[in-house]
């Protein structure tokens, strides 16, 4: 049975040019957790298995960051960000959990300053 | 020039075990986690598992139940894999393979290494 | 485990003709397909990855498409070197699996 939960950071703003660390946390579960993958809608932004180390896609390669932790650093924002980001765990022996991040990307002006894991 | 050499060819018998070696030369070891896949004759390829020098972090494809046991030894720039309880379907080719950095592709392969289980 | 099946498993086709290899996960793997090229004899070699990006040296006649389930590699205009077997392979999660092979032979 699958008793583990994942806590997001939730919904997030940042400003556009500007930095987010996006971070999820599994908790209630003894599981190992063997990868976690992180995608936007249908693209895969990254990997990070816990042997092999990181994977970052390509077309994310100038602008993702592996870490801190499990997490993942996205840099030079623009609007074309926003939207909702996934991050994937795999884990042992419980399977798959999913948890989900909603990022929206502010011209510099309208940005919330203090969203929680924000980079100044 | 990336090159990954590996031993040569090798006949055991059942229930045996084999070690294969994969020296790297033309990079920094420890960079690059090294893959081991093999091939049966006139079938596909088949992952084994994979080994991470930089924190000495070992994957293995659970489809070989513990007989795989991948090493290395970063003053030499050497990796072993390791198979023993052999059978006959263990006959095939074996390849160790580089990943490239950050990329979950296996960019430089050996030149294999033919293992061969006959009583 | 995720499955990759490819079709066809071989064709024979002419040096100048357009090929195409479908490869399909069991499973949603995103983007996280590569494709490798197989002559008899010889060790794979990387030339596809991520699935649209060819590796270093790789003419580019060949090329890869997919997303989700669906991978595509094409090769636009075959040349005589280009008659191997191809292999798609996931890495979305482990265990890492190949797809069967195509065996691309001379018409």
């Known amino acids: 049975m699958m008793t583990g939960t994942i806590e997001t950071t939730g919904n997030i703003s940042a400003e556009k040019g500007g930095s987010i660390i996006l971070q999820c946390h599994l908790s209630s579960t003894t599981a190992q957790v063997t990868q976690v993958n992180w995608e936007q809608q249908d693209q895969l932004l990254a990997i990070c298995n816990a042997d092999l180390g990181w994977h970052i896609s390509p077309s994310f390669k100038d602008r993702v960051a592996p870490g801190p932790g499990l997490g993942l650093t996205l840099q030079s924002l623009t609007v074309n960000d926003t939207g909702e980001y996934f991050c994937i765990y795999h884990t042992y022996p419980d399977g798959t959990y999913t948890g989900r991040i909603f990022l929206e990307v502010l011209e510099s002006s309208v940005a919330e300053h203090g969203a929680r894991f924000q980079i100044p | 020039e990336v090159q990954l050499v590996q031993s040569g060819a090798e006949v055991k018998k059942p229930g045996s075990s084999v070690k294969v070696s994969c020296k790297a030369s033309g990079y920094t070891f420890t960079e690059h986690v090294i893959h081991w896949v093999r091939q049966a004759p006139g079938q596909g390829l088949e992952w084994m598992g994979g080994?991470?020098?930089?924190?000495?972090?070992?994957i293995y494809n659970q489809i070989f139940r513990g007989r795989v046991t991948i090493t290395a030894d970063k003053s030499t720039s050497t990796a072993y894999m390791e198979l023993s309880s052999l059978r006959s379907e263990d006959t095939a080719v074996y390849y160790c393979?580089?990943?490239?950095?950050?990329?979950?592709?296996?960019?430089?392969w050996g030149q294999g290494t033919t293992v061969t289980v006959s009583s | 485990d995720i499955q990759m099946t490819q079709s066809p498993s071989s064709l024979s086709a002419s040096v100048g003709d357009r090929v195409t290899i479908t490869c399909k996960a069991s499973q949603h793997v995103s983007n996280a397909v590569v494709w490798y090229q197989q002559k008899p004899g010889k060790a794979p070699k990387l030339l596809i990855y991520s699935p649209s990006y060819r590796f270093t040296g790789v003419p580019s006649r060949f090329s890869g498409s997919g997303s989700g389930t669906d991978f595509t590699l094409t090769i636009s205009s075959l040349q005589p070197e280009d008659f191997a077997t191809y292999y798609c392979q996931q890495h979305y999660s482990t265990p890492w699996t190949f797809g069967g092979g195509t065996k691309v032979e001379i018409k």
């Open positions: 393979a580089r990943a490239a950095k950050l990329l979950f592709a296996m960019d430089y």
């Open positions: 080994f991470n020098p930089n924190h000495d972090g070992t």
